[in-house]
C-alpha cells in the first residue's frame, strides 16, 4: 500500500465532528495534546484540522484493476507539526509531533460509506478504524463490510476553506 507521491494531491482545512454532531477538539495539556469528543456551546469555535490527501496503490490488484487500483490516504493535522497517529498496540489514536516523511501510523485510508460522512481506516492495521469510545477517539476493529456503516466510525467534515498546497 505505497503512497504514489510525496506531495498531497489536495488539502482541506475542516472541522471534524461525529455522526451525532459532537465536535472533535484538541487541547494542549502538559506539553502534549489530548483529543476530546464533546458537545460545543452554541457560539464556541470548532477546532480545525488540515486533511492532506495522498494517492496510494491498492496492496493487491487481484480485482483486475491493474494500475487503476488507487485509494486515497489522508493525514490529519490539527496544529503545525502534529499529526494523528494510530497506536495499534494500545488501540488508541494519539497526536504526535512528526517530521516528514511521516510514519505509516499517520496515514489512514479514506472511506465514504455515505456521501456526507467519512471513515478513516488505519494504514498499518487494515480493518481497524478511528472511532468514538467513551468520549475519546480510539481504534475500533470492524469485522465485516456491513459494519462499516456503524455510527461510531462515521465522521463529518465541515470544510472551512481550501488549503493551497505549494
Amino acid at each position: 500500500m505505497s503512497i504514489t507521491g510525496i506531495s498531497p494531491i489536495t488539502e482541506y482545512l475542516a472541522s471534524l465532528s461525529t455522526y451525532n454532531d459532537q465536535s472533535i477538539t484538541f487541547a494542549l495539556e502538559d506539553e502534549s495534546y489530548e483529543i476530546y469528543v464533546e458537545d460545543l456551546k452554541k457560539d464556541e469555535k470548532k477546532d480545525k484540522v488540515l486533511l492532506s490527501y495522498y494517492e496510494s496503490q491498492h496492496p493487491s490488484n487481484e480485482s483486475g484493476d491493474g494500475v487503476d487500483g488507487k485509494m486515497l490516504m489522508v493525514t490529519l493535522s490539527p496544529t503545525k507539526d502534529f499529526w494523528l497517529h494510530a497506536n495499534n498496540k494500545e488501540h488508541s489514536v494519539e497526536l504526535h509531533k512528526s517530521e516528514k516523511p511521516l510514519p505509516d501510523q499517520a496515514f489512514f485510508v479514506l472511506h465514504n460509506m455515505h456521501s456526507n460522512s467519512v471513515s478513516f481506516e488505519s494504514k498499518t492495521d487494515p480493518g481497524v478504524f478511528i472511532g468514538v469510545k467513551d468520549n475519546h477517539l480510539a481504534l475500533i476493529k470492524v469485522d465485516s463490510s456491513e459494519n462499516l456503516s456503524t455510527e461510531n466510525i462515521l465522521f463529518k467534515l465541515s470544510e472551512t476553506h481550501h488549503h493551497h498546497h505549494h
Epitope: I9, T10, Y12, H58, S63, G64, D65, D68, G69, K70, M71, L72, V109, L110, H111, N112, M113, H114, S115, S145, L148, S149, E159, H161, H162, H163, H164, H165
Partner: antibody, heavy 122, light 107 residues
Framework: QVKLLQSGAALVKPGASVKMSCATS????????VSWVKQSHGKGLEWIGE????????NFNENFKGKATLTVDKSTSTAYMELSRLTSEDSAIYYC???????????????WGQGTLVTVSS | NIVMTQSPKSMSISVGDRVTMNCKAS??????LAWYQQKPGQSPKLLIY???NRYTGVPDRFTGGGYGTDFTLTINSVQAEDAAFYYC?????????FGGGTKVEIK
C-alpha cells in the same frame, strides 16, 4: 480491464418510466461509487447522482430528486437507473461512470459507459 | 450551485500549435477541478483531475493549471486526434457541475 456496458437505446412515451442498466466487469463492484450523468443538447453535461453498492447509500443532485432512482444488484455487478414521469426534457444520453478510487467518492469520472440514448416522444 | 464558465466556446487551430482554454468557477473551488475530452459519438474521457494531475495514460502534451476560480487546460503541440470538445468539472463537493465546453477544431 474495467468495463461499463450500458443497455440499449429506448423510445418511450411522455409520462412513462424507463429503467436502464450498467453492467460492470474488471473491478470490485462493491468498492467503488457509481455515478450517472445526463448529456443533452440544451443543458450539456449534468450529474444526476451516485450510489455506493457496498452500503446502498446514494446522493442526488437536487434537480433529479424524484426523477431518478438508483439501485444496484451486487450479485451481477450491475447498476440501474430508473427515470419516471418522462417528458421531452428527459430526452438525452445517460452515462454510468465510476471514479478512480476504492471506497471514496470524489465525484471524479474516470470510467464511462458507452451511454444509453433515451428519446421521449408520443 | 457553483457555475463553471468555459472560454472560448470554440477555436480552430493547426497541428503543432499550442492551445490554451479557460474555465472560471463562480466561487473558490481550490484545486477541485477535472478536465474531460469528448470526441464525436464517444463518451467523455478523464484527462486531468485535481486541477493539474494527469490521469493514467493521458499524453503529457495535456497540462492543467490554476487554483481557486481560474483554471486552464493547455495542449502543447496539438495533434489531429485532439479535435474534440473539452469540458471542465468541479469535483469533490456535491453537486459537481460542468462547464459548457470548448470545441477544438483542426484547420
Amino acid at each position: 480491464q474495467v468495463k461499463l456496458l450500458q443497455s440499449g437505446a429506448a423510445l418511450v412515451k411522455p409520462g412513462a418510466s424507463v429503467k436502464m442498466s450498467c453492467a460492470t466487469s474488471g473491478f470490485s463492484f462493491t468498492d467503488y461509487w457509481v455515478s450517472w450523468v445526463k448529456q443533452s443538447h440544451g443543458k450539456g453535461l449534468e450529474w444526476i447522482g451516485e450510489i455506493y453498492p457496498n452500503s446502498g447509500a446514494d446522493n442526488f443532485n437536487e434537480n433529479f430528486k424524484g426523477k431518478a432512482t438508483l439501485t444496484v444488484d451486487k450479485s451481477t455487478s450491475t447498476a440501474y437507473m430508473e427515470l419516471s414521469r418522462l417528458t421531452s426534457e428527459d430526452s438525452a444520453i445517460y452515462y454510468c461512470t465510476r471514479g478512480p478510487y476504492y471506497y471514496s467518492t470524489q465525484i471524479i469520472f474516470a470510467y464511462w459507459g458507452q451511454g444509453t440514448l433515451v428519446t421521449v416522444s408520443s | 450551485n457553483i457555475v463553471m464558465t468555459q472560454s472560448p466556446k470554440s477555436m480552430s487551430i493547426s497541428v503543432g500549435d499550442r492551445v490554451t482554454m479557460n474555465c472560471k468557477a463562480s466561487q473558490n473551488v481550490g484545486n477541485n477541478l477535472a478536465w474531460y475530452q469528448q470526441k464525436p459519438g464517444q463518451s467523455p474521457k478523464l484527462l486531468i483531475y485535481y486541477a493539474s494531475n494527469r490521469y493514467t495514460g493521458v499524453p503529457d502534451r495535456f497540462t492543467g493549471g490554476g487554483y481557486g476560480t481560474d483554471f486552464t487546460l493547455t495542449i502543447n503541440s496539438v495533434q489531429a486526434e485532439d479535435a474534440a470538445f473539452y469540458y471542465c468539472q468541479r469535483i469533490y463537493n456535491s453537486p459537481p457541475t460542468f462547464g459548457g465546453g470548448t470545441k477544438v477544431e483542426i484547420k
